[in-house]
Amino acid sequence: LTCLGGFASPGPVPPSTALRELIEELVNITQNQKAPLCNGSMVWSINLTAGMYCAALESLINVSGCSAIEKTQRMLSGFCPHKVSAGQFSSLHVRDTKIEVAQFVKDLLLHLKKLFREGQFN
């Protein structure tokens, strides 16, 4: 049982490599987490699977001053075909529903692993 979504290829880097690197970064974050990630900041949740890279970035970009996720933010921007800035609100988000950054990252890792297993690189 899987759920899949597609994304834009991040330039010249093979999509499978880019996705694997993003997964590895999220694994590092979840495994090295000691104190609450980003001081327990909350971000918008997401209610769909399509277009989730831009939606994920739109959520995480609103977290500032958190060095632990800066690389993730940069990597996600490579998967999103349009420019994302803080304060944007996508229809993919669940309005009035926020979750902890740590849970968001954990769930993003779960979803990306599914995509990778199914070969959904573009």
Epitope: T2, C3, S45, L48, M52, Q103, L110, K114
Partner: nanobody, 118 residues
Framework: GVQLLESGGGLVQPGGSLRLSCAAS????????MGWARQAPGKGLEWVSI????????YYADSVKGRFTISRDNSKNTLYLQMNSLRAEDTAVYYC???????????WGQGTLVTVSS
Amino acid sequence: GVQLLESGGGLVQPGGSLRLSCAASGFIFAWYDMGWARQAPGKGLEWVSIIACKGGKTYYADSVKGRFTISRDNSKNTLYLQMNSLRAEDTAVYYCATAEDEPGYDYWGQGTLVTVSS
């Protein structure tokens, strides 16, 4: 934190119907395979039905095939179980849960009691 809250259980006569709901919060519901499990009095826990994240693929235990229907509304972060043609042997506590193989993604609700009796 993560919360799964079941509702809709109760007493119903054999042949009757019930619709269970599970309200999810604290995690990205849309990215999880979800399911319903049940535990009858004095018995072990068994999976009743599982539904994939997008709602396309479903699994049903043989004992409920053709009678139960699982569904989800990702926009409402809610999981459902429509139970028709209920039998005495369906009496159990029904649990809403994530259905992921990955370690660390195991979340369960507190359960809702379904009693089928005349």
